[in-house]
């Protein structure tokens, strides 16, 4: 759920880390209404996720580690 590059809500499904290639942080104090993690998938989709959810935190950590190792 995004509009003009801002997430307006969060996905209600789980993404497996193997389908995600990167992420962007959306901050509520930088022009958007809510904090969000925008996951970028292999199929070139952008998915808005709740940064407070456990599965989101795990994937962010896994992706951050992957970037460091590159």
């Amino acid at each position: 759920a995004s509009n003009f590059d801002c997430c307006l809500g969060y996905t209600d499904r789980i993404l497996h880390p193997k389908f995600i290639v990167g992420f962007t942080r959306q901050l509520a104090n930088e022009g958007c209404d809510i904090n969000a993690i925008i996951f970028h998938t292999k199929k070139k989709l952008s998915v808005c996720a709740n940064p407070k959810q456990t599965w989101v935190k795990y994937i962010v950590r896994l992706l951050s580690k992957k970037v460091k190792n590159m």
């Epitope: 789980i14 880390p17 940064p51 959810q53 456990t54």
Partner: antibody
């Protein structure tokens, strides 16, 4: 009723490895985040890392990266923690713990509601 | 070293109200839910408060949690002898991309 049953105490030599198991019963296994937490004698709690079994890939505290391996076997509902190149400072009680909500409902990441009784690992020459 | 700072000890007499503080930063407490654990001597930790101020079932409402900015606190009212334990705050840290515990506070009932 969720129960986490850990393997028994271990005495290890410096430089060796230890593998501690944590069998979960009474709930779905694969969609919950499991953490490993340790506590050295007289010290505080230290988060070591965790795994969401359905994700397969674990995450680790930066301090233990390279020495710690966390795995999960969904066929036996068991999580494992292996620590290599042990040193005396690794002497501690090692706990496995499961989060309050499953990987989707939890918006309080790290709310570790269910705990094993702990496994004492002693590293001594 | 722990990223969340707590006083090493706190004390009170039976029936009193005691507060334990937990100080962090924007990357942990400021942006994430705070959880509190109670550890009785020789036992595994027990989740006392989750999501800043929520009680798991079975936890008496004598225990309450609050959060403001980058600090959190745990209040114990109507102090009882069985409350004598170590208390830890904890939160996810977005800079470390991991979970962090506070330094721990030993609560003594005088």
């Amino acid at each position: 009723q969720v129960q986490l049953v850990q393997s028994g105490p271990e005495v290890k030599k410096p430089g060796s490895s230890v593998k501690v198991s944590c069998r979960a019963s009474g709930g779905t296994f694969s969609t919950y985040a499991f953490s490993w937490v340790r506590q050295a004698p007289g010290q505080g709690l230290e988060w070591m890392g965790g795994i969401i079994p359905v994700f397969e890939t674990p995450i680790y505290a930066q301090k233990l990266q390279g020495r710690l391996t966390i795995t999960a076997d969904t066929s036996t509902d068991t999580a494992y923690m292996e620590l290599s190149n042990l040193r005396s400072g690794d002497t501690a009680v090692y706990y496995c713990a499961r989060e309050w909500g499953d990987y989707y409902s939890s918006v309080s990441s790290g709310a570790l509601h269910y705990w094993g009784r702990g496994t004492l690992v002693t590293v001594s020459s | 070293q722990a990223v969340l700072t707590q006083p090493s000890s706190a004390s009170g007499t039976p029936g009193q109200r005691v507060t334990i503080s937990c100080s962090g930063s924007s990357s942990n407490i400021g942006n994430n839910a705070v959880n509190w654990y109670q550890q009785l001597p020789g036992t595994a930790p027990k989740l006392l408060i989750y999501n800043n101020n929520q009680w798991p079932s079975g936890v008496p409402d004598r225990f309450s949690g609050s959060k403001s900015g980058t600090s959190a606190s745990l209040a114990v009212s109507g102090l009882q002898s069985e409350d004598e334990a170590d208390y830890y705050c904890a939160a996810w840290d977005d800079s470390l991309n991991g979970y962090v515990f506070g330094t721990g506070t030993q609560l003594t009932v005088l």
